[in-house]
Interface confidence: low
């Protein structure tokens, strides 16, 4: 992926819109489209003040780990969806899009250098608090987490990483 493609805000905006659309669709289905089990996902809440006070390496860890956890969660929901006869087939399209989107975002962030920043220097990773997680038991919750993660930590991180690259 071109190194600074994600710095074009329209790119991230496209994924955010897809996530919001999926969230809206799943809001309308029975019980939020139950997954039948709890899937671990990152806590997307951003305390802006704390975020600004912690170093870039810590941000990178939170974003990289969050993206990995979200990817696992979306793949798990994809598997659950494939084995379920109770969930509408139209949802499969949104889950597939999200799986594909998370893969693309991972590549774009890797190109931006988030992976290197997340593992070096080692102090950044070791001093970072363990990633806070929550449980999602419906597709609606899962897509809300996905949407909030993109609009929150990912948007904040790419903003500062792209600005650093501009200097």
């Amino acid at each position: 992926a071109p190194a600074r493609l994600i710095c074009d805000s329209r790119v991230l905006e496209r994924y955010i819109l897809e996530a919001k659309e999926a969230e809206n669709v799943t809001m309308g289905c029975a019980e939020g489209c139950s997954l039948g089990e709890n899937i671990t996902v990152p806590d997307t809440k951003v305390n802006f003040h704390h975020w600004k006070k912690s170093e870039a390496g810590r941000h990178a860890v939170e974003v990289w780990q969050g993206l990995a956890l979200l990817s696992e969660a979306m793949l798990r929901s994809q598997a659950l969806l494939a084995n379920s006869s109770q969930l509408p087939e139209t949802l499969q399209v949104h889950v597939d899009k999200a799986v594909s989107g998370l893969r693309s975002l991972t590549s774009l962030l890797r190109a931006l250098g988030v992976q290197k920043e997340a593992v070096s220097p080692p102090e950044a990773a070791s001093s970072a608090a363990p990633l806070r997680t929550v449980a999602a038991d419906t597709l609606c919750k899962l897509f809300r987490i996905y949407s909030n993660f993109l609009r929150g930590k990912l948007k904040l991180y790419t903003g500062e990483a792209c600005r650093r690259g501009d200097r």
Epitope: L12, K45, V46, H49, H50, G152, K155, G159, C162, R163
Partner: antibody, heavy 127, light 108 residues
């Protein structure tokens, strides 16, 4: 419904300290999901964020660079209020001062939005 | 320091659509809010998180944010929409986070 009631003098002499208080009802100053701000507005500077305090297992604050050396914002948990002190004021500090509540760690998407405001207090700095 | 730039004034006829812009370096990578302020009153939040409306704000108010520009769109403008509108962004708490404001005049 959150309500913010402001109080304090409307006239302060140059070089003295401007002191305002914001009493909170419908929420707690020690809330783990809210933040409490002071913002001012003048014809020359427009709307200007001054500073914030918030509680997340301990108290934190952030202040605007423009006033950092002169400002203090303190909570008063016993009265469920917070205060602004601005030292060494000059006529440039003449403005309408607002207290406001923002939500930096609660609902995703409302990380910074000032959803509730006090009515504002016009403070004139003049001898 | 981070600067948000707004046009000083925008005029629109009743029933038409008003668009107020707010520009800042790389603004699309931040959340943007919009506030409405009528004379003698405190500002009121009308849009947060680029495009979301707080409860009680009419659907006529919408927002977008991409590239270097955020836009507040007010469709089917009414006389009561006449006010000053301010954009704000949390680019940095330590910088001035408000735009200079735009006076919306409803013609007629």
């Amino acid at each position: 419904q959150v309500q913010l009631q402001q109080s304090g003098p409307g006239l302060v002499k140059p070089s003295q300290t401007l002191s305002l208080t914001c009493a909170i009802s419908g929420d707690s100053v020690s809330s783990n999901t809210a933040a409490w701000n002071w913002i001012r507005q003048s014809p020359s500077r427009g709307l200007e964020w001054l500073g914030v305090i918030y509680y997340r297992s301990k108290w934190y604050n952030d202040y605007a660079v423009s006033v950092k050396s002169r400002i203090t914002i303190n909570p008063d948990t016993s009265k469920n209020q917070f205060s602004l002190q601005l030292n060494s004021v000059t006529p440039e500090d003449t403005a309408v001062y607002y207290c406001a509540r923002s939500v930096p760690g609660g609902d995703p998407g409302l990380e910074h939005a000032f959803a509730y405001w006090g009515r504002g207090t016009l403070v004139t700095v003049s001898s | 320091s981070y600067v948000l730039t707004q046009p000083p004034s925008v005029s629109v006829a009743p029933g038409k659509t008003a668009r107020i812009t707010c520009s800042g370096d790389n603004l699309g990578t931040y959340y943007v809010e919009w506030y409405q302020q009528k004379p003698g009153q405190a500002p009121v939040l009308v849009i947060y998180d680029d495009s979301d409306r707080p409860s009680g704000i009419p659907e006529r108010f919408s927002g977008s944010n991409s590239g270097n520009t955020a836009t507040l769109t007010i469709s089917r403008v009414e006389a009561g929409d006449e006010a000053d509108y301010y954009c704000a962004s949390f680019a940095s708490w330590s910088d001035s986070v408000f735009g200079g404001g735009t006076k919306l005049t409803v013609l007629g």
